[in-house]
């Protein structure tokens, strides 16, 4: 007997983080033998949706014309071939932004940082939240969580970064969220650039900025400076 059918690939276009009201397309790609595709959403009656394959039958499209809270969540897909159902795909987490008012992102002691020094990014929300996320643009793994230890609501989260180097130049935004659904995020904060000056790699003041604690290529996730919780919040990796 042949082994289990290979699991399909699941992804979203234009991406998995979608603003409220925008359209998103979920794709499930299996094999040419696929006869039907099924999309399941966690905590929803299964299947969440079924679609016939598009020619040449190796993938199916699931369309969301206007993103709302109801669509945010964790998805998996399967396909059916003549020999049965496939393994489930790796999960896709579809996140909606715009659920809450935007927080403010600022820098202590200053937004212009000398290379090798330290900086703390502060994400502050008007109303108490229990999760804060720091986003670095154009990073492959952009999310750094600070989540409340005991469901305690916080107005802010601190992201200490040290040492700052020009290698991690970029623009940062933050989001806030409630624990009951980490798939629902606030509007993004206004962007904050952390300008790194006087770096060893480039003696000229540079308009690029960085705020990371680990040296490494651009697409590495931000690294926290330590595991000590700040403001009752705990670090999580995406």
């Amino acid at each position: 007997q042949a082994g289990p059918l290979p699991k399909p690939t699941l992804w979203a276009e234009p991406g998995s983080v979608i603003s409220w009201g925008n359209s998103v397309t979920i794709w499930c790609q299996g094999t040419l033998e696929a006869r039907e595709y099924r999309l399941d959403k966690e905590e929803s009656p299964a299947p969440w949706d079924r679609q016939n394959p598009l020619e040449p039958k190796n993938k199916a499209r699931f369309s969301i014309p206007s993103m709302t809270e109801d669509y945010a969540g964790r998805y998996r897909c399967y396909y059916r071939s003549p020999v049965g159902w496939s393994q489930p795909s790796d999960p896709l987490e579809l996140v909606m932004t715009g659920a809450y008012s935007k927080p403010t992102l600022s820098a202590l002691p200053s937004p212009l940082v000398t290379s090798g020094k330290s900086v703390t990014l502060l994400c502050q929300s008007r109303s108490p939240m229990d999760t804060f996320l720091l986003i670095k643009e154009r990073a492959a793994h952009p999310l750094l969580h600070l989540r409340s230890e005991h469901g305690a609501q916080q107005h802010q989260a601190e992201f200490p970064m040290s040492p700052v180097t020009s290698v991690h130049g970029g623009t940062y935004r933050c989001f806030s969220s409630h624990g009951f659904s980490h798939y629902l995020l606030s509007h993004p904060s206004d962007p904050l650039e952390l300008i790194v000056s006087g770096s060893l790699e480039d003696p000229r003041p540079s308009p690029t900025r960085s705020v990371s604690t680990a040296a490494g290529p651009e697409d590495q996730p931000l690294m926290p400076t330590g595991s000590v919780p700040h403001s009752g919040l705990r670090r999580h990796w995406e």
Partner: antibody, heavy 119, light 112 residues
Framework: EVQLLESGGGLVQPGGSLRLSCAAS????????MSWVRQAPGKGLEWVSV????????YYADSVKGRFTISRDNSKNTLDLQMNSLRAEDTAVYYC????????????WGQGTTVTVSS | DIVMTQSPLSLPVTPGEPASISCRSS???????????LDWYLQKPGQSPQLLIY???NRASGVPDRFSGSGSGTDFTLKISRVEAEDVGVYYC?????????FGQGTKLEIK
């Protein structure tokens, strides 16, 4: 009413130590970064140090780095400045100040406490 | 470090007349977010400093509207539309764009 009240100043010999305290009231202390600023006799203002709301991040002027330590106790609403290896040029009035929302501006200041370093 | 230079260092003013203080920084304080990281403080005789203006042009809470801040980049101005006797003291500008935060030398405003 938002208030900051410094204490701990006094006369100390060069090389000695002193610990300044600042008692805060009238606001959610843990939500705000706090700073120390000093003013030498007849001179202008000089920033000394700042600490984030949680106390997890601290920053210093080069002139005091390695000698001064800023800390806070959010359960007691107090800000401290431990000053070691004091020099004559550390003689000043030391003010504690609360930073405003989003770290913009020092919007509340204490009355100051005088530190004199002299033999 | 960013150097802050104020002028004039002494400013005698007649009550009811306008007053203007200039502050220049050794490098631009305009950040990419559109904010100028410059504050103005007033230290009245025998008192602690108080915040007047933050981010270049935003009046702090409780500050009379006769005080205004303007400028961008490296050149900033604090204006008092009509000076009152209670405005006497030393005015300081301070940059917060880059640590260490640095103050200007101060401008002493006195009544003629």
């Amino acid at each position: 009413e938002v208030q900051l009240l410094e204490s701990g100043g006094g006369l100390v010999q060069p090389g000695g130590s002193l610990r300044l305290s600042c008692a805060a009231s009238g606001f959610t202390f843990s939500s705000y970064a706090m700073s120390w600023v000093r003013q030498a006799p007849g001179k202008g203002l000089e920033w000394v140090s700042v600490i984030s709301g949680s106390g997890g991040s601290t920053y210093y002027a080069d002139s005091v780095k390695g000698r001064f330590t800023i800390s806070r106790d959010n359960s007691k609403n107090t800000l401290d400045l431990q000053m070691n290896s004091l020099r004559a040029e550390d003689t000043a009035v030391y003010y504690c100040a609360k930073l405003g929302d989003y770290y913009y501006g020092m919007d509340v200041w204490g009355q100051g406490t005088t530190v004199t370093v002299s033999s | 470090d960013i150097v802050m230079t104020q002028s004039p260092l002494s400013l005698p003013v007649t009550p009811g007349e306008p007053a203007s203080i200039s502050c220049r920084s050794s490098q631009s304080l305009l950040h990419s977010n559109g904010y100028n990281y410059l504050d103005w403080y007033l230290q009245k005789p025998g008192q602690s400093p108080q915040l007047l203006i933050y981010l270049g042009s935003n009046r702090a809470s409780g500050v009379p509207d006769r005080f205004s801040g303007s400028g961008s980049g490296t050149d900033f101005t604090l204006k008092i539309s009509r000076v009152e006797a209670e405005d006497v003291g030393v005015y300081y500008c301070m940059q917060a764009l880059q640590a260490p935060w640095t103050f200007g030398q101060g401008t002493k405003l006195e009544i003629k």
